[in-house]
Amino acid sequence: APRGTQAEESPFVGNPGNITGARGLTGTLRCQLQVQGEPPEVHWLRDGQILELADSTQTQVPLGEDEQDDWIVVSQLRIASLQLSDAGQYQCLVFLGHQNFVSQPGYVGLEGLPYFLEEPEDRTVAANTPFNLSCQAQGPPEPVDLLWLQDAVPLATAPGHGPQRNLHVPGLNKTSSFSCEAHNAKGVTTSRTATITVLPQQPRNLHLVSRQPTELEVAWTPGLSGIYPLTHCTLQAMLSDNEVGIQAGEPDPPEEPLTLQASVPPHQLRLGSLHPHTPYHIRVACTSSQGPSSWTHWLPVETPEGVPLGPPENISATRNGSQAFVHWQEPPAPLQGTLLGYRLAYQGQDTPEVLMDIGLRQEVTLELQGDGSVSNLTVCVAAYTAAGDGPWSLPVPLEAWRPGQAQPVHQLVKETSAPAFSWPWW
């Protein structure tokens, strides 16, 4: 083919076209050249900048057998999934001889239905509690107007006239669905539909009604639950761990709590089988058909002390001359509190009972006196806490000591210290 008379004329015989479409579109831009001699490498430009990592392929075919014959070169730039960042002016650049040649420009534009950057999400809310939902969409083309829908009913008369990106909902009394429509010149896109589940409000005013050593009675005020009646409330009780501790509002207890369900109403529950004189933390949540409320904060409570559940054991009472020796061991049964001491009572067959507070000692020496007219002297011991006395031991007879065997007592007992209390015997 005859050569061109103007060597500086562009070798391009095809330029990039225009691609305008929605996100995700796949397209190809092409440049075509017819050059004499060695075909050049084709570079792609976007907005005047070389695309270093372009997904391009170059095909070159000689039109003759001579080295100086013409070559056809086609460079194809593939845009795999159109994004906003792909938009711009595209050109091809070749270096031929001592000259640069740039093709005519083609344009890539993003234009289609609105594209959501943010859509309303499913969530749970407490009844009659304000919350916000978010929706954001973009073109091009702009502008994009949003229209919110609640249970498929528009919340404004026309797009762009109601709330836009953030929808403030003052409160719901029933589970509802929300979506948003994005409108632009190309049409309408509808977001996902978010389900807003209405749960009961957190119960309020969790408090103790009564306390017993192994039992606590608690009550609370239920929160609003919308149109859904409460089905039950759940109470959790947790032994307080002094090392870990349960902070107010801590999301999860450090170990498995005791969980009880309460039918409602009444909004009250008796917790039994507790340890006396023990700190606990309790919390409550109430449930409707839609699900449970959030838990209340952990409330610290404590069972009061109880009396020891059993008497001291292994009581021995022996006389040696003018003295009687009595000793015993701590009750094996639970003390139900802090042991404050022991009470000892002794009594002859026809004499009044004498009561002594021994304190925390587990033995006592009694001075014996009299003419031996008192017989069948017996001793009883009880442990006590701040809550009172535990059960008394069975009467133990005071026997005279002799080697290998206790000896009977023939004298009255004279206590070494005055009794602190004088209580009825049984």
Epitope: G4, T5, Q6, V13, R30, Q32, V74
Partner: antibody, heavy 120, light 107 residues
Framework: EVKLVESGGGLVQPGGSLKLSCAAS????????MSWVRQTPEKRLEWVAY????????YYPDTIKGRFTLSRDNDRNTLYLQMSSLKSEDTAMYYC?????????????WGQGTSVTVSS | DIVMTQSHKFMSTSLGDRISITCKAS??????VAWYQQKPGQSPKLLIY???TRHTGVPDRFTGSGSGTDYNLTISSVQAEDLALYYC?????????FGAGTKLELK
């Protein structure tokens, strides 16, 4: 509206010459490459010549090379095809056509054609 | 030279039918294929170029496809005004070459 109007066709004897013109309007003539394509009486389409927008590059098929010359006057928005050494197989309807921007060799607008008959 | 072969000189169709006209290139033309429509007494009109790019104003019932050496022009629902002569052309390299044409006619 893009408009291409060919003229200059007619009856010519074998070995004779003829100059065809194509007047362009409705677009920026000097921005587009142009081609001539002919259609034989049997309705076959044959490419005749190509010229770049500035006129610096011309291409012809081997059957035409050396006998026809394509030129353009961008000031007059006119394309010319000088034909010489005409043969009977050159008898056809001659169309001028504009190349697309995306491929100058794909032809987006054609004139109504001018008829050339080579016969003794 | 690249030879473009349209294997059917004639194709019969009914209105509303979907029809595909085929064209085969003698070598890979990198999708540089154009399709033209010519009605009696008129000049050819460009329908498709780069195998699948629809020219301005062409109804979207016309679709081009193909790659390598095999190309198709599909009319999704033939209308009366589509009855015409259809040519393929490679616009990959000079010399530009056309197929012999396929005439679309009613059954």
């Amino acid at each position: 509206e893009v408009k291409l109007v060919e003229s200059g066709g007619g009856l010519v004897q074998p070995g004779g010459s003829l100059k065809l013109s194509c007047a362009a309007s409705g677009f920026t003539f000097n921005s587009y490459s142009m081609s001539w394509v002919r259609q034989t009486p049997e309705k076959r389409l044959e490419w005749v010549a190509y010229i770049s927008n500035g006129g610096g590059r011309t291409y012809y098929p081997d059957t035409i090379k050396g006998r026809f010359t394509l030129s353009r006057d961008n000031d007059r928005n006119t394309l010319y095809l000088q034909m010489s050494s005409l043969k009977s197989e050159d008898t056809a309807m001659y169309y001028c056509a504009r190349g697309t921007t995306e491929s100058y060799y794909a032809l987006d607008y054609w004139g109504q054609g001018t008829s050339v008959t080579v016969s003794s | 030279d690249i030879v473009m072969t349209q294997s059917h000189k004639f194709m019969s169709t009914s209105l509303g039918d979907r029809i595909s006209i085929t064209c085969k290139a003698s070598q890979d033309v990198i999708t540089a294929v154009a399709w033209y429509q010519q009605k009696p007494g008129q000049s050819p009109k460009l329908l498709i170029y780069w195998a699948s790019t629809r020219h301005t104003g062409v109804p979207d019932r016309f679709t081009g496809s193909g790659s390598g050496t095999d190309y198709n022009l599909t009319i999704s629902s033939v209308q009366a005004e589509d009855l015409a002569l259809y040519y393929c052309q490679q616009h990959f390299s000079t010399p530009l070459t056309f197929g012999a044409g396929t005439k679309l006619e009613l059954k």
